[in-house]
């Protein structure tokens, strides 16, 4: 059974990842440029069901593509490199979802555009954090 | 383990119908987009068509658009191909294959279709 | 429709040696929508490398994948005997989803 000490360490990690994922979202919607409409003919793949933390291996998944728009970008809105801002993510996406879980994902029929995947990863968090406090 | 079988290929004559399956296991298959792809003899891979995991939505090469259609039955774990208006340049080993996001991840080991007179 | 045009046809090595295949398409492709197969004769393809540098699951790590744009590369580093085959590169970037017509990697 989780302790409240791990379950406290998870609210932290998902607040993290919450907020970094904002801070991506906030630095597209900033972002005055034609390049935007070039980010936004990417396709994102979406979880069919995203509720649990193992459900995080499809956003794991995506984290490749995430890297090559925001490299589009060039963007002064994010503090970091897209490299360094997916690396931290990864880094939590893994220690959230488990390394050792063998969970093949399952996506949605429909692709979406980067700020529809956002939104809905963003939406997970919040929705998984307030089942923890 | 994901499985993927492929049948129903044979000798046809120009002109007929046949009709391939692929019987899956192993994964949830009403979560993934299928596809077949097809390998004429000694030759390279050529996509053929798809189909999203619901079944709702369907894509195909020109090059057999209104001749083939594919289907699947996800209470079976079926995808099939309906082929009609068979022609020769349609000879060729018919692989199925699970759809992974942008890649193809697993396949099938292959039905060999002849058309021929 | 995006061509896959991959080079060279054939590549005649010995095992141990490093094999450095080609694959060059028609218009920008993005590189997570790059893929690599592997196919021995008789066989159906296998998966090695997809998002142009991943390895899949399995995969030896000789076996590696770089490049973007229009300009990508498999990259064996050291042969070994049950490599000998034929390698496709995959787009799935535009529609339809295209093949390169591969590259044989033969013994020499």
């Known amino acids: 059974a989780p302790t409240s000490s791990s379950t406290k360490k998870t609210q932290l990690q998902l607040e993290h990842l919450l907020l970094d994922l904002q801070m991506i979202l906030n630095g597209i919607n900033n972002y005055k440029n034609p390049k935007l409409t070039r980010m936004l003919t990417f396709k994102f793949y979406m979880p069919k069901k995203a509720t649990e933390l193992k459900h995080l291996q499809c956003l794991e998944e995506e984290l490749k593509p995430l890297e090559e728009v925001l490299n589009l970008a060039q963007s002064k809105n994010f503090h970091l490199r897209p490299r360094d801002l997916i690396s931290n993510i990864n880094v939590i996406v893994l220690e959230l979802k488990g390394s050792e879980t063998t969970f093949m994902c399952e996506y949605a029929d429909e692709t979406a555009t980067i700020v529809e995947f956002l939104n809905r990863w963003i939406t997970f968090c919040q929705s998984i954090i307030s089942t923890l406090t | 383990e994901v499985q993927l079988l492929e049948s129903g290929g044979g000798l046809v004559q120009p002109g007929g119908s046949l009709r391939l399956s692929c019987a899956a296991s192993g994964f949830t298959f009403s979560s993934y987009a299928m596809s077949w792809v097809r390998q004429a003899p000694g030759k390279g891979l050529e996509w053929v068509s798809a189909i999203s995991g619901s079944g709702g939505s369907t894509y195909y090469a020109d090059s057999v658009k209104g001749r083939f259609t594919i289907s699947r039955d996800n209470s079976k774990n079926t995808l099939y191909l309906q082929m009609n208006s068979l022609r020769a340049e349609d000879t060729a080993v018919y692989y199925c294959?699970?759809?992974?996001?942008?890649?193809?991840?697993?396949w099938g080991q292959g039905t060999l279709v002849t058309v021929s007179s | 429709e995006i061509v896959l045009t991959q080079s060279p046809g054939t590549l005649s090595l010995s095992p141990g040696e490093r094999a450095t295949l080609s694959c060059r398409a028609s218009?920008?492709?993005?590189?997570?929508?790059l893929a690599w197969y592997q196919q021995k004769p008789g066989q159906a393809p296998r998966l090695l490398i997809y998002g142009a540098s991943s390895r899949a699951t399995g995969i030896p790590d000789r076996f590696s994948g770089s490049g973007s744009g229009t300009d990508f590369t498999l990259t064996i580093s050291r042969l070994e005997p049950e490599d000998f085959a034929v390698y496709y590169c995959?787009?799935?970037?535009?529609?339809?989803?295209?093949f390169g017509q591969g590259t044989k990697v033969e013994i020499k």
């Open positions: 995959q787009q799935t970037w535009g529609s339809p989803p295209t």
């Open positions: 294959a699970k759809r992974h996001a942008r890649y193809f991840d697993y």
């Open positions: 218009q920008s492709v993005s590189s997570s929508y």
